[in-house]
């Protein structure tokens, strides 16, 4: 029960985290104009990974996309890549983890397969979370570096904008969303990995019980294959312990054939 809860919670936490990573990636407020030096500005600038925006005195916000790919700074491209990789890995992880959930039965999927899938999704969530945290941190570092640059027409490296001294940019809401979301995805991934460890031993126990039961139920009678009651009872055992190591179970039930030798 605890394993199912851990797995379910890990899935939900990761789901929230990935939704947050997607939200952060799409948000325009990765960097916002620092109002410390100019608190009376009627024109408020903020920038995202895909476009830069200006909120004017009328309350109207105008956004312009970065319609160049080669003209953008390598750091911005790297952040974009990290966030996209994080989203893709997270999405695949979610897909895998849905099938791995213990509370969801899909055909005759064995617990060992579910354990492997849980571990796979957990690792994917961990990597996804790390990608998001790395992406946001790289961008934050870029902001901190640019904040202290005081060259009159410095190239800020955010959307290829030329920035004059008076406009400095500080951390936007998207950075905090990204950090939190990355952290949640990471935590969710760790929970999935923990749940996997809980799933694996249960399977081993089942196999052990299965072997034990098989051993006791086989009746070694010289009456040949038909006379063997053990084969029939072992079939029942296999239905009860739908556990995975079938070949071994079958090997256990066949010694009666050797009576012919």
């Amino acid at each position: 029960m605890a394993v199912t809860a851990c797995q379910g919670l890990g899935f939900v936490v990761s789901l929230i985290g990935i939704a947050g990573i997607i939200a952060a990636t799409c948000m325009d407020q990765w960097s916002t104009q620092d109002l410390y030096n100019n608190p009376v500005t009627a024109v408020f600038n903020y920038q995202g990974l895909w476009r830069s925006c200006v909120r004017e005195s009328s309350g109207f916000t105008e956004c312009r996309g970065y319609f160049t790919l080669l003209g953008l700074p390598a750091m911005l491209q790297a952040v974009r890549a990290l966030m996209i990789v994080g989203i893709v890995l997270g999405a695949i992880g979610l897909l895998v983890s849905i099938f791995a959930l213990k509370c969801i039965r899909i055909g005759s999927m064995e617990d060992s397969a579910k354990a492997n899938m849980t571990l796979t999704s957990g690792i994917m969530f961990i990597v996804s979370g790390l990608c998001a945290i790395a992406g946001v941190s790289v961008f934050a570092n870029m902001l901190v570096t640019n904040f202290w640059m005081s060259t009159a027409n410095m190239y800020t490296g955010m959307g290829g904008m030329v920035q004059t001294v008076q406009t400095r940019y500080t951390f936007g809401a998207a950075l905090f969303v990204g950090w939190v979301a990355g952290g949640l995805t990471l935590i969710g991934g760790v929970m999935m990995c923990i749940a996997c460890r809980g799933l694996a031993p249960e399977e081993t126990n089942y196999k052990a019980v299965s072997y034990h039961a098989s051993g006791h139920s086989v009746a070694y009678k010289p009456g040949g294959f038909k006379a063997s009651t053990g084969f029939g009872s072992n079939t029942k055992n296999k239905k009860i312990y739908d556990g995975g190591a079938r070949t071994e179970d079958e090997v256990q039930s066949y010694p009666s054939k050797h009576d012919y030798v």
Partner: antibody, heavy 115, light 113 residues
Framework: EIQVQQSGPELMKPGASVKISCRSS????????IHWVKQSRGKSLEWIGY????????RYNQKFEGKATLTVDKSSTTAYMHLSSLTSEDSAVYYC????????WGQGTLVTVSA | DIVMTQSPSSLTVTAGEKVTMTCKSS????????????LTWYQQKPGQPPELLIS???TRQSGVPDRFTGSGSGTDFTLTISSVQTEDLAVYYC?????????FGAGTKLELK
């Protein structure tokens, strides 16, 4: 069609207060701030402040802080400006303006303060 | 506060003449975020509210005749009327749309000779 309609002229006694209305239609009312501008006879324009109809947030020109109070009623898409403790200096035409770069202005409300 | 200085205060012209009026701001109106100058020009005829002519220093408002041209950057701006018509007789105001409080120039009055 975008329209910005202001209330009629007001003749007030010194020390009294007045509330001017500005009704907007034909556009998304909560998407643009409503700005208020004062124009004394034969003089230039003075920005009083704005109100954000979406949040109700306001910003005032320091010169008009305490004199003007801006409010909004989203349901009737109407902005209001309340002028208190009127003096002869407050006699002027008051305009409300909205949309990008003050593209639309009300016709103006003449406030006359006289004993 | 940003001070807007307009010159001349009045202009006497004849129809068809080219007219240039200037507006100087005490601080730069250039926004580095989008490289736009937040200066607006309005035309006000007697008994009427101001009417938007040009935004962001050079963007003509739709419906405004192309004889009106705005130019300039930073602190120095110009409004040019290539061929004055009688309906252009009005007061022209420039406005700082970059910093609070938003401020207007004293205006340039265009009169007929």
């Amino acid at each position: 069609e975008i329209q910005v309609q202001q209330s009629g002229p007001e003749l007030m006694k010194p020390g009294a207060s007045v509330k001017i209305s500005c009704r907007s239609s034909g556009y998304s009312f909560t998407s643009y701030y409503i700005h208020w501008v004062k124009q004394s006879r034969g003089k230039s324009l003075e920005w009083i402040g704005y109100i954000d109809p979406f949040s109700g947030g306001t910003r005032y020109n320091q010169k008009f802080e305490g004199k003007a109070t801006l409010t909004v009623d989203k349901s009737s898409t109407t902005a209001y400006m309340h002028l208190s403790s009127l003096t002869s200096e407050d006699s002027a035409v008051y305009y409300c303006a909205s949309l990008r770069f003050f593209a639309y202005w009300g016709q103006g409300t003449l406030v006359t303060v006289s004993a | 506060d940003i001070v807007m200085t307009q010159s001349p205060s009045s202009l006497t012209v004849t129809a068809g003449e080219k007219v240039t009026m200037t507006c100087k701001s005490s601080q730069s109106l250039l926004n580095s975020g989008n490289q736009e100058n937040y200066l607006t020009w309005y035309q006000q005829k007697p008994g009427q509210p101001p009417e938007l002519l040009i935004s962001r220093a050079s963007t003509r408002q739709s419906g405004v005749p192309d004889r009106f041209t705005g130019s300039g950057s930073g602190t120095d701006f110009t409004l040019t009327i290539s061929s004055v018509q009688t309906e252009d007789l009005a007061v022209y105001y420039c406005q700082n749309d970059y910093s609070y409080p938003l401020t207007f120039g004293a205006g340039t009055k265009l009169e007929l000779k």
